[in-house]
């Protein structure tokens, strides 16, 4: 007698972080022969969805068409075979963005610097927030937070060629409700050739500054749902 | 072996509340949803709802939602079926039932609640 | 809510015959059914789930059939003690709903 089933993968299509009034998908797979799937909110039953045949299919979408702030927060999903239950998904962290204002993003000494250099990035925002979130675009996207009443400074240290890349900055009014994002700051470490080619896509940082969101971004990485489940080390928890 | 183990027999008056237990053992009891069946004298079947143990997450048939709350305590793999406002519609055999991937697959022995004046 | 219509209501059939009880949803339950047996003064028994699937310790006379929204419970040269009340169940949606029973006498 099966007593456990596996916990289903959750995540959200196109994006995690969702401008307001735009839509998104929020997706949770688990097994083939799957009568029920529930989408639980902020700890209450959301949506249920019962696939149609059950045998054929294993992954239900839940379509939100206007994201806003109340639809912002942490969702699960469970399914179950009979009257048999399987343990919770991770929990996803939807955010809503394009709130209210506009942070600035500057890079200091300069968007141009040598490998080894100390780069730091400062993320400015005139009202009310005391939270600031900085973003590296690419495979995976690196969330670092840094706190100020205007403005939060996110050193990178030495920098590698490995730090090269196109960088944004949010505020955050709260855990899911994030600002526009700020223009971009593209980047760019000279150094030794040899290392350029030898570099990895995306640098290490320290394990409690650095939390990493899988995305799902046109990468492939759809293919390979344990690689992005987004909440396996949820920076926003 | 899996045993379901009701309180038998429970009398009441119009307007009360009641509430039955439901001892699991041999089996993980929050492992398993636990589900409430009515029964009235000589009639058919009626799922009443069902708690999850381990979460406390609890459905409901809308017809029973008012009338009914379900509970669990863990410590005691008890699960237990409150029901207000009593009347003599309320009188009847109520069931708990594992709920497993194989459906309905242990039942109790029934708990015979009397609502009389 | 799911309606399951059950027939017939009431059977009266000898030991060593063999019997059929339908069950018809009301839209379609994608298999998701159970077969209980029931007998006088005791708790129902599950004796078929997902439609087809024979219970533990369910004697091979039984056996269920059936896809979409129509079911059929099959038992082969009945025993005596196959005698009681029959009642199919959806575990599709909620709520789950019970079909009206159907009382196997002995003729």
């Known amino acids: 007698q099966q007593q456990t089933l596996p916990k289903p993968f959750i995540w959200a299509e196109p994006h995690f972080m969702v401008p307001k009034e735009k839509q998104v998908t929020i997706c949770c797979q688990g097994n083939y022969g799957a009568v029920e799937y529930q989408l639980h909110f902020e700890g209450s039953l959301f949506a249920v969805d019962r696939p149609k045949p059950p045998e054929r299919i294993n992954k239900v979408q839940f379509y939100i068409p206007d994201m806003n702030s109340r639809m912002a927060g942490q969702y699960s999903c469970i399914y179950r075979v009979g009257e048999l239950w399987s343990e919770p998904s991770n929990l996803l962290d939807l955010v809503v963005t394009e709130m209210y204002d506009t942070p600035t993003l500057s890079v200091h000494p300069g968007p141009e610097v040598i490998s080894g250099e100390k780069v730091t990035f400062y993320c400015r925002l005139d009202t009310a927030t005391s939270m600031f979130l900085l973003l590296k675009e690419g495979r995976s996207s690196h969330v670092q937070r840094g706190y100020g009443k205007v403005q939060a400074e996110f050193p990178l240290g030495p920098v590698t060629t490995a730090h090269r890349g196109t960088y944004r900055c949010f505020g955050s009014y709260n855990n899911h409700a994030w600002s526009f994002p700020s223009e971009p700051v593209k980047l760019l470490v000279t150094g030794d050739i040899e290392n350029t080619s030898l570099a990895p896509e995306d640098p290490t940082f320290p394990a409690d500054t650095w939390g990493t969101y899988l995305l799902t971004t046109e990468t492939g990485l759809q293919k390979d749902h344990a690689l992005w489940d987004h909440t396996a080390q949820n920076l926003l928890r | 072996q899996v045993q379901l183990q009701q309180s038998a027999v429970e009398l009441a008056r119009p307007g009360a509340s009641v509430k039955m237990s439901c001892k699991a053992s041999g089996y993980t009891f929050t492992s398993f949803t636990m589900h409430w069946v009515k029964q009235r004298p000589g009639q058919g079947l009626e799922w009443i709802g069902y708690i999850n143990p381990s979460s406390g997450y609890t459905e409901y048939n809308q017809k029973f939602k008012d009338k009914t709350t379900l509970t669990a305590d863990k410590s005691s793999s008890t699960a237990y079926m409150q029901l207000d406002s009593l009347t003599s519609d309320d009188s009847a055999v109520y069931y708990c039932?594992?709920?497993?991937?194989?459906?309905?697959?242990?039942w109790g022995q029934g708990t015979l609640v009397t609502v009389s004046a | 809510d799911i309606q399951m219509i059950q027939s017939p209501a009431s059977l009266s059939v000898s030991v060593g015959e063999t019997v059929t009880i339908t069950c018809r949803a009301s839209?379609?339950?994608?298999?998701?059914l159970a077969w209980f047996q029931q007998k006088q003064g005791k708790s129902p028994q599950l004796l078929v789930y997902?439609?087809?699937n024979l219970a533990d310790g369910v004697p091979s006379r039984f056996s269920g059939s059936g896809s979409g929204t129509q079911y059929s419970l099959k038992i082969n040269s009945l025993q005596s003690e196959d005698f009681g009340i029959y009642y199919c169940q959806h575990f599709w949606g909620t709520p789950r709903t019970f079909g009206g029973g159907t009382k196997l006498e002995i003729k």
């Open positions: 839209e379609n339950i994608y298999s998701n």
């Open positions: 997902a439609a087809t």
């Open positions: 039932v594992r709920g497993s991937s194989r459906g309905f697959d242990y």
